[in-house]
Interface confidence: low
């Protein structure tokens, strides 16, 4: 038997990927482990090999199909098992009956770009990636802007309570370098969480016109 506490957490990206992290205190070393996905109403099943991400946690991605294919629905239940090899047998180490649309974490927004920049404001747009058409417009976003001399953790969060894939940042300082990030979350799902932050978009405001009062 393996001693210690085990935690097995998985999220569905709403299309064709389930990402899982398994952590185990006092876990087995040098043992091959995998996640096995067994849907209740689908003909397929899928496995992925758990790879170490720290001393006591492992992660893997269950690739269910083409990135934009809709592999699961709101009525699906997928039994997810952590299986570790013990000699010639596979031992169940952790298990959950996973409701994909209750455990959503979308991919980070992509294609961030500056639409228009001025001295004090900047209009930025982005796109969501691999998000299910089931959500329609039921998404929300958080954005943050990194100012010179500050950290991301200090940046105030701007909340967009609707599916709005653009923002107009205002009260910016002229001729200043900024970075911008955005993340997305569906409104659906009891255990749904925010996507990772997007890759930062760097931009610079225009300098103030000479002789003008700014």
């Amino acid at each position: 038997a393996v001693n210690g506490t085990s935690q097995f957490t998985c999220f569905y990206n709403s299309r064709a990927n389930i990402s899982c992290v398994w952590s185990q205190d006092g876990a087995l070393q040098d043992t091959s482990c995998q996640v096995h996905a067994w849907p209740d109403r689908r003909r397929w099943n899928q496995t992925c090999e758990l790879l170490p991400v720290s001393q006591a946690s492992w992660a893997c991605n269950l690739i269910l199909g083409a990135p934009d294919s809709q592999k699961l629905t709101t009525v699906d239940i997928v039994t997810l098992r952590v299986l570790c090899r013990e000699g010639v047998r596979w031992r169940v180490m952790a298990i959950q009956d996973f409701k994909p649309f209750e455990n959503l974490r979308l991919m980070a927004p992509i294609s961030l770009q500056v639409v228009h920049v001025e001295t004090h404001r900047c209009n930025i747009s982005w796109e969501i990636s691999q998000a299910s058409h089931y959500f329609e417009r039921h998404l929300e976003f958080e954005a943050r802007t990194l100012s010179p001399g500050h950290t991301w953790e200090e940046a105030p969060l701007l909340t967009l309570k609707q599916k709005q894939e653009w923002i107009c940042l205002e009260t910016l300082t002229p001729d200043t370098q900024y970075e911008f990030q955005v993340r997305v979350k569906p409104l659906q799902g009891e255990f749904t969480t925010w996507s990772p932050w997007s890759q930062p978009l760097a931009f610079r405001t225009k300098p103030a016109a000479l002789g003008k009062d700014t």
Epitope: I77, T79, R81, R89, W90, V92
Partner: nanobody, 123 residues
Framework: QVQLVESGGGLVQAGGSLRLACALS????????MAWFRQAPGKGREFVAS????????DYVASVQGRFTVSRDNNKNTVYLQMNSLKPEDTAVYYC????????????????WGQGTQVTVSS
């Protein structure tokens, strides 16, 4: 060391009901597919019902299908066998079994066993 302890057996009249319970200790319960077997006097041990680790899939021998229901409570480390419409031919010692390999639960020699609980059905 894994231990299984059954309870709930007894004497019941034909047509009556009993609920057996089996508690697992010494390991993590959700690692195990659980099953019930029975052994009537002078006969071999036979498979009755099983439930997979998640509780989602159950399996029954034909003779108890529709009368017996196997279930589990992963928070209580316990598996149950609800027995309705009991018949005299259900009289046996009922054994709880556990196996971490859910493909092997019907295999008599690879399971961990409880000590058994007597069920007697009188006519």
């Amino acid at each position: 060391q894994v231990q299984l302890v059954e309870s709930g057996g007894g004497l019941v009249q034909a047509g009556g009901s009993l609920r057996l319970a089996c508690a697992l200790s010494g390991d993590v319960f959700v690692r195990y597919t659980m099953a019930w077997f029975r052994q009537a006097p002078g006969k071999g041990r036979e498979f009755v019902a099983s439930v997979t680790d998640s509780g989602r899939t159950t399996d029954y021998v034909a003779s108890v299908q529709g009368r017996f229901t196997v279930s589990r409570d992963n928070n209580k480390n316990t598996v149950y066998l609800q027995m309705n419409s009991l018949k005299p031919e259900d009289t046996a010692v009922y054994y709880c079994a556990a196996n971490t390999d859910y493909f092997q639960i019907r295999s008599l020699d690879r399971n961990t066993w409880g000590q058994g609980t007597q069920v007697t059905v009188s006519s």
